[in-house]
């Protein structure tokens, strides 16, 4: 029961996380015009991964797509790639995990197969979450660098009449959505990996036993009947996948590589 709950919860948490990653990727507010300590303008600028927008004081908003690929900063391209990889992995993970859910019966699928699928989807969710967190963190790091560079530019060379005031950008809502969504996907993936350990069938080495029924003998060999038939393996299940434990260890060490901000 606990295994089913853990698996189900992991699936739901990952589903919410991936929906969040998709939402963040599509959002226009990755960076927003910094209004603090800035000359107040009657227009508000904000930018996403795919287009930049300008909102006038009347509420009129105009967005323009980035119609160039080669002209865009490499970092922006990298963030796009990370987010898309995260979405694709997450989507595949969701598809796999649907079939892996203990509460769903598909033909005579074995518990070992479900365990494998749960582990696979869990790893996919973890990588998906890490991709999203990495993408958002890279973008945030880019923003922080540009913010301080433009701040330095604002306060230099002010001897004469200032001709231009540089627009500074700060963190937009999409960054926070991305971080939270990535974290949820990662947590969901970890939960799926934990659930996988409980799902895995116990390999019990039974001695071959001969049963004498109505005068003729039938030999039952180990592994002859699978878990799906209701015989053989104990459905309480003990841990047999050390791989699951290893994945959790990886989860703890891996994010630090992407700890940019």
């Amino acid at each position: 029961m606990a295994v089913t709950a853990c698996q189900g919860l992991g699936f739901v948490v990952s589903l919410i996380g991936i929906a969040g990653i998709i939402a963040a990727t599509c959002m226009d507010q990755w960076s927003t015009q910094d209004l603090y300590n800035n000359p107040v303008t009657a227009v508000f600028n904000y930018q996403g991964l795919w287009r930049s927008c300008v909102r006038e004081s009347s509420g009129f908003t105009e967005c323009r797509g980035y119609f160039t690929l080669l002209g865009l900063p490499a970092m922006l391209q990298a963030v796009r790639a990370l987010m898309i990889v995260g979405i694709v992995l997450g989507a595949i993970g969701l598809l796999v995990s649907i079939f892996a859910l203990k509460c769903i019966r598909i033909g005579s699928m074995e518990d070992s197969a479900k365990a494998n699928m749960t582990l696979t989807s869990g790893i996919m969710f973890i990588v998906s979450g890490l991709c999203a967190i990495a993408g958002v963190s890279v973008f945030a790091n880019m923003l922080v660098t540009n913010f301080w560079m433009s701040t330095a530019n604002m306060y230099t060379g002010m001897g004469g009449m200032v001709q231009t005031v540089q627009t500074r950008y700060t963190f937009g809502a999409a960054l926070f959505v991305g971080w939270v969504a990535g974290g949820l996907t990662l947590i969901g993936g970890v939960m799926m990996c934990i659930a996988c350990r409980g799902l895995a069938p116990e390999e019990t080495n039974y001695k071959a036993v001969s049963y004498h029924a109505s005068g003729h003998s039938v030999a039952y060999k180990p592994g002859g009947f699978k878990a799906s038939t209701g015989f053989g393996s104990n459905t309480k299940n003990k841990k047999i996948y050390d791989g699951g434990a290893r994945t959790e260890d990886e989860v703890q060490s891996y994010p630090s590589k992407h700890d940019y901000v």
Partner: antibody
Framework: QVQLVQSGAEVKKPGASVKVSCKAS????????IHWVRQAPGQGLEWMGR????????YYNEKFTGRVTMTRDTSTSTVYMELSSLRSEDTAVYYC?????????????WGQGTTVTVSS | DIVMTQSPDSLAVSLGERATMNCKSS????????????LTWYQQKPGQPPKLLFY???TRESGVPDRFSGSGSGTDFTLTISSLQAEDVAVYHC?????????FGGGTKLEIK
């Protein structure tokens, strides 16, 4: 058609207050900012501030902060501009103007103007 | 505050001739986000309120004759009347529509020579 009709001319003594009204018609009153701009005799235009009738949010030119108050009455589609502690240099024609939607923050319709004379 | 400087203060042009007036802002009115200049031109005839002519420096308001044209970017802007008509006699104001507080130029008075 869009119309902004302002109240009549006023003559005030220094130190007094004046309240000018601007009645809007021909459009959804709560959806557009209303600005107040004044023009002293023979001078240029001077922006005083604006109010969003939908929420009552205001934004004033710092020069007038503390002296100007902009309010609205949605039931009558009317915006009011009150200027207190009047001085002789406040003698001007006061205009209300609607900010156009998608027109680069510009004012596309103007009231006929209200002449305010501050004289002792 | 942004200072808007209009030149000349007054301009006398013969009917049918070209009239050109300038407006200079102390800071750039170009918004990098949409590459638009937040400068507005108004026409004010004697005893009347101002009338919107151009926004975004060069976008003509509906109903404005095409003999009027607006140009310029950043800090320098121009309003041109290709062939002056008698009804064009007015004061022309430019306005900073980018920074608060909005500021106007002193105006250019256009007369017939």
């Amino acid at each position: 058609q869009v119309q902004l009709v302002q109240s009549g001319a006023e003559v005030k003594k220094p130190g007094a207050s004046v309240k000018v009204s601007c009645k809007a018609s021909g459009y959804i009153f709560t959806n557009y900012w209303i600005h107040w701009v004044r023009q002293a005799p023979g001078q240029g235009l001077e922006w005083m501030g604006r109010i969003y009738p939908g929420t009552g949010n205001t934004y004033y030119n710092e020069k007038f902060t503390g002296r100007v108050t902009m309010t609205r009455d949605t039931s009558t589609s009317t915006v009011y501009m009150e200027l207190s502690s009047l001085r002789s240099e406040d003698t001007a024609v006061y205009y209300c103007a609607r900010e156009g939607y998608g027109k680069g923050n510009s004012m596309d319709y103007w009231g006929q103007g209200t002449t305010v004379t501050v004289s002792s | 505050d942004i200072v808007m400087t209009q030149s000349p203060d007054s301009l006398a042009v013969s009917l049918g001739e070209r009239a050109t007036m300038n407006c200079k802002s102390s800071q750039s009115l170009l918004n990098a986000g949409n590459q638009k200049n937040y400068l507005t031109w108004y026409q004010q005839k004697p005893g009347q309120p101002p009338k919107l002519l151009f926004y975004w420096a060069s976008t003509r308001e509906s109903g404005v004759p095409d003999r009027f044209s607006g140009s310029g970017s950043g800090t320098d802007f121009t309003l041109t009347i290709s062939s002056l008509q008698a009804e064009d006699v007015a004061v022309y104001h430019c306005q900073n529509a980018y920074y608060y507080p909005y500021t106007f130029g002193g105006g250019t008075k256009l007369e017939i020579k």
